[in-house]
Amino acid sequence: HTAAQDNCTCPTNKMTVCSPDGPGGRCQCRALGSGMAVDCSTLTSKCLLLKARMSAPKNARTLVRPSEHALVDNDGLYDPDCDPEGRFKARQCNQTSVCWCVNSVGVRRTDKGDLSLRCDELVRTHHILIDLRHRPTAGAFNHSDLDAELRRLFRERYRLHPKFVAAVHYEQPTIQIELRQNTSQKAAGDVDIGDAAYYFERDIKGESLFQGRGGLDLRVRGEPLQVERTLIYYLDEIPPKFSMKRLTA
């Protein structure tokens, strides 16, 4: 299915406009901002979600800036250019003709330049480390229960296959979730780890992108797991190219 037929909505992306104008009167949904058709049986790409977020009314709750710790994009929110498949274009530019290269999750991986800057290819982010600190609890969570519940969450809520959740580490109160997905491993139809991580990040912040589904209610053996801070680290298949000036800053 592309969308819920009865009331014509997109279960996986509330930042859409849906109408029964698809083939045979089927419900079809288009992302806000880009107007691109989205497949509502899976996650929408982060690029289209960011574009939709930037097009939303400025007073909308969805425009809360990432916390100082969220390393999704050190440069803050921007209105990205997406390719016809909804992926980030390798080169992004702002209205003042400042350009930079990004990876597959839209994070800047070079110094900023001008319109002459070349970004030859979209470099894949193949390893994502999600670093969480949970609120104090009576005791530590059981590691294997925590591992099982987080893998189940990524499988059932974000439809990310368990094989892409490489590891779950736990040293109270820090939880680390490692997502790994090389280009060669990602088959057609597989959810991208970058998209899953973005949906998870928004869920953790109480800004769920899902339509109709409840917010994230994460429990381990019935005990609520409440996250108080999140850091996300991205590793690309090709190391980023920053000048020494930035590296020593």
């Epitope: 299915h1 279960p11 049986s41 591992d147 099982a148 519940e149 296959h161």
Partner: antibody
Framework: QEQLKESGGGLVQPGGSLTLSCKAS????????VSWVRQAPGKGLEWIGY????????YYATWVNGRFTISSHNAQNTLYLQLNTLTAADTATYFC?????????????WGPGTLVTVSS | DVVMTQTPASVEVAVGGTVTIKCQAS??????LAWYQQKPGQPPKLLIY???KLASGVSSRFSGGGYGTEFTLTISGVECADAATYYC????????????FGGGSEVVVK
């Protein structure tokens, strides 16, 4: 040829224990999840639990309450179901069933089942 | 806890006829629903997944439909070999689940 084969069933006394095995062949055990499902004579299918062997993650039906334990020996491509404190109500054919390898829990490969009879 | 309810428990159908079995989920499971066929003395066989997709090797006489909480399995041009018990199963989650399977519907072919 992809196959699952259960073994270890038989007659057991009430209050007793039993461990069932499910041997997989013809596919890579680590790429799939497997459920144990039982069926009492003349009754419907009842799910017991699920394991993703690559990470030893297990999930159980709410009614299990710690009485049953699912485990795996990945090197031997074998899955286990340990049954404890058995009663006559646990008399059933026990099946293991493999998922399709996708993210939803559809089971497209089933073993023939093994019969467990709890009686004194 | 998602509870699956199947109707009818038993249904008679003539050879060549059409039969429809219904399955209701206690909460929204989107399209995560599977249908199985089971004959006496055999394990279940996957017929349909994701509510309407035909499993490999399954006759196109079987079709599935529905979304959210209401689902159907339809068998058209019924043959004697279709006499069996059919089960629906929510394929969405293994968390906090009592039984993902419906109670079953027996199809008797006359």
């Amino acid at each position: 040829q992809e196959q699952l084969k259960e073994s270890g069933g038989g007659l057991v006394q009430p209050g007793g224990s039993l461990t069932l095995s499910c041997k997989a062949s013809g596919f890579d055990f680590n790429n799939y999840g497997v459920s144990w499902v039982r069926q009492a004579p003349g009754k419907g299918l009842e799910w017991i639990g699920y394991i993703y062997p690559a990470y030893h993650n297990t999930y159980y039906a709410t009614w299990v309450n710690g009485r049953f334990t699912i485990s795996s020996h990945n090197a031997q491509n074998t899955l286990y179901l340990q049954l404890n404190t058995l009663t006559a109500a646990d008399t059933a054919t026990y099946f293991c069933a493999r998922d399709t390898g996708s993210t939803d829990y559809n089971f497209n490969l089933w073993g023939p089942g093994t019969l467990v009879t709890v009686s004194s | 806890d998602v509870v699956m309810t199947q109707t009818p428990a038993s249904v008679e159908v003539a050879v060549g006829g059409t039969v429809t079995i219904k399955c209701q989920a206690s909460e929204d499971i989107e399209s995560y629903l599977a249908w199985y066929q089971q004959k006496p003395g055999q394990p279940p066989k996957l017929l349909i997944y994701e509510a309407s997709k035909l499993a490999s090797g399954v006759s196109s006489r079987f079709s599935g439909g529905g979304y959210g909480t209401e689902f159907t399995l339809t068998i058209s041009g019924v043959e004697c070999a279709d006499a069996a018990t059919y089960y629906c199963q929510q394929a969405l989650t293994v968390g906090n689940v009592d039984n993902p399977f419906g109670g079953g519907s027996e199809v008797v072919v006359k």
